[in-house]
């Protein structure tokens, strides 16, 4: 979920003030200190999966 506000970046992406473009929040796992990662809100919970057949 993205933080509310006027945000033309698509879901799962955030604006980089340094690069002047929307960036994919998934890349924050590898580079968590990138400037745009601040605007990447908490990831939705993983879907429930049965642990047995």
């Amino acid at each position: 979920e993205q933080a509310p506000g006027t945000a033309p970046c698509s879901r799962g992406s955030s604006w980089s003030a340094d690069l002047d473009k929307c960036m994919d929040c998934a890349s924050c796992r590898a580079r968590p200190h990138s400037d745009f990662c601040l605007g990447c809100a908490a990831a939705p919970p993983a879907p429930f999966r049965l642990l047995w057949p």
Partner: antibody
Framework: QVQLVQSGGGLVKPGGSLRLSCAAS????????MSWVRQAPGKGLEWVSA????????YYADSVKGRFTISRDNPKNTLYLQMNSLRAEDTAVYYC?????????????WGQGTLVTVSS | LTQSPGTLSLSPGERATLSCRAS???????LAWYQQKPGQAPRLLIY???TRATGIPDRFSGSGSGTDFTLTISRLEPEDFAVYYC?????????FGGGTKVEIK
């Protein structure tokens, strides 16, 4: 209503530790980055630290890097600032703030502030 | 970020023009202005260089791009006498200007 309520300030000796808390209410906490800003007596505002909504990304001012740790407990809607190896120059009123991020950047909701005094 | 002047002495009803200058180009989307009164927390006035925050009266306006930004108060009200700070986000950090105090002449 949207609110940030701070606690945890006080008097501490140089080299000591202190933990500040900021309890959020009235908004979806996980949807917002959060930040700490301080203000020394009679001085201007100084950014201290920030953290993303998930807590996975943290940012620090050079003046506190390695000594302060920002964290958040999303189920409890609470933001923390753990301050270690405190120095006299850390004496200030500390504010927590909600960060408007993603496409615009700014701090749109502020706590009431809590005074931290570092003195022997 | 360098703010000027340090102090602005004006009378109610006058126009206030506050300047914020960056040493290098700043994304307009990351430029904000705050008002702070003695003993109070700062209050967000403007974000995105020119967009008023919720509840901010239209006598406050922001403009500028690149390295030069301006906060204008069209007609000063008694409650507007305070300290004003600009702030920018970039390189994974927030930076505040030194502030401009708007005082009653």
């Amino acid at each position: 209503q949207v609110q940030l309520v701070q606690s945890g300030g006080g008097l501490v000796k140089p080299g000591g530790s202190l933990r500040l808390s900021c309890a959020a209410s009235g908004f979806t906490f996980t949807s917002y980055a959060m930040s700490w800003v301080r203000q020394a007596p009679g001085k201007g505002l100084e950014w201290v630290s920030a953290i993303s909504g998930s807590g996975g990304s943290t940012y620090y001012a050079d003046s506190v890097k390695g000594r302060f740790t920002i964290s958040r407990d999303n189920p409890k809607n609470t933001l923390y600032l753990q301050m270690n190896s405190l120095r006299a120059e850390d004496t200030a009123v500390y504010y927590c703030a909600r960060v408007r991020a993603n496409y615009y950047y700014g701090m749109d909701v502020w706590g009431q502030g809590t005074l931290v005094t570092v003195s022997s | 970020l360098t703010q000027s002047p340090g102090t602005l002495s004006l009378s109610p009803g006058e126009r206030a023009t506050l300047s914020c200058r960056a040493s290098q180009s700043v994304s307009s989307r990351s430029l904000a202005w705050y008002q702070q009164k003695p003993g109070q927390a700062p209050r967000l006035l403007i974000y995105g260089a020119s967009t008023r925050a919720t509840g901010i009266p239209d006598r406050f306006s922001g403009s500028g791009s690149g390295t030069d930004f301006t906060l204008t108060i069209s007609r000063l009200e008694p409650e507007d006498f305070a300290v004003y700070y600009c702030q920018q986000y970039g390189s994974s950090r927030f930076t505040f200007g030194g502030g401009t105090k708007v005082e009653i002449k």
